[in-house]
Amino acid sequence: AILGRSETQECLFFNANWERDRTNQTGVEPCYGDKDKRRHCFATWKNISGSIEIVKQGCWLDDINCYDRTDCIEKKDSPEVYFCCCEGNMCNEKFSYFPEMEVTQPTSNPVTPKPP
């Protein structure tokens, strides 16, 4: 392990479409991948009229967009589906939305998901 880097071995798993996809609905997912590549966690969610609906959470393959991010934060302005990724075990338990382009203070607060 490289000093100061969070190795990701497992992530929070959630799948809103678990019946259709024939997976578990929630749990802990061990992250697999090529031994020399980095692994991350991700979260995806929708904001339906102010209500947060988690779509999926799980492991994410080596992605420079996720390097050295200990927190799962979506920075894209008003995406249709929110996505964030991070490094470190279970770092996707909490996720937030702080759009980069915002000049004013972000109105959204960090989200702690409560699976239905």
């Epitope: 697999y32 090529d34 590549k37 991700f42 995806t44 779509v55 999926k56 799980g58 492991c59 994410w60 393959l61 080596d62 992605d63 420079i64 967009n65 894209k76 995406p79 249709e80 589906v81 929110y82 996505f83």
Partner: antibody, heavy 115, light 111 residues
Framework: QVQLVQSGAEVKKPGASVKVSCKAS????????INWVRQAPGQGLEWMGT????????SYAQKFQGRVTMTRDTSISTAYMELSRLRSDDTAVYYC????????WGQGTLVTVSS | QSALTQPASVSGSPGQSITISCTGT?????????VNWYQQHPGKAPKLMIY???KRESGVSNRFSGSKSGNTASLTISGLQAEDEADYYC???????????FGGGTKLTVL
Amino acid sequence: QVQLVQSGAEVKKPGASVKVSCKASGYTFTSSYINWVRQAPGQGLEWMGTINAVSGSTSYAQKFQGRVTMTRDTSISTAYMELSRLRSDDTAVYYCARGGWFDYWGQGTLVTVSS
Amino acid sequence: QSALTQPASVSGSPGQSITISCTGTSSDVGSKNYVNWYQQHPGKAPKLMIYGVSKRESGVSNRFSGSKSGNTASLTISGLQAEDEADYYCGTFAGGKYYGVFGGGTKLTVL
């Protein structure tokens, strides 16, 4: 083992559209991106765009903006690339590749545009 | 994003070393460790050889190595073998906020 299997060769007329599929297996489809790359006969590789397989978010090369649409169906681990208003210079082999590093590639789909 | 610049061709004899360059700008190759190298044999799909400037892809021979100096990334192949004869492309990571771009390709001939 990781595999990306693409749909078969297509022959299209100028002005038509083509939709190429890329079925992934051997890994969790929703754990990365799918990139699309094309290669005209005797030419180099040309990046067309990418889709985040879990969120569906896309980024397209400026050259193809307005003409290309990338989608995916997570229930069958398949990504799609549709190119519209085809011209003869769109004749090429179209590849899908996994992840931001393009670490696994499909076998390629030859699209021939000819009147 | 403009294409990366590679020499059109290079050649070498078996056992020799060759280097293929890939020149970009300070905003792509120069500032990010996200250049990759691909090998493509005629009629086949490209194969990832080196990613993130210098990391060898799993299963790739240690005769292949990558490096970077300033705005130029390089692929070095030592102990050239006949099967190394192929086209080589440099390219960048693509996904999220990063847009992909490839070099024009370099044809390697093993004499």
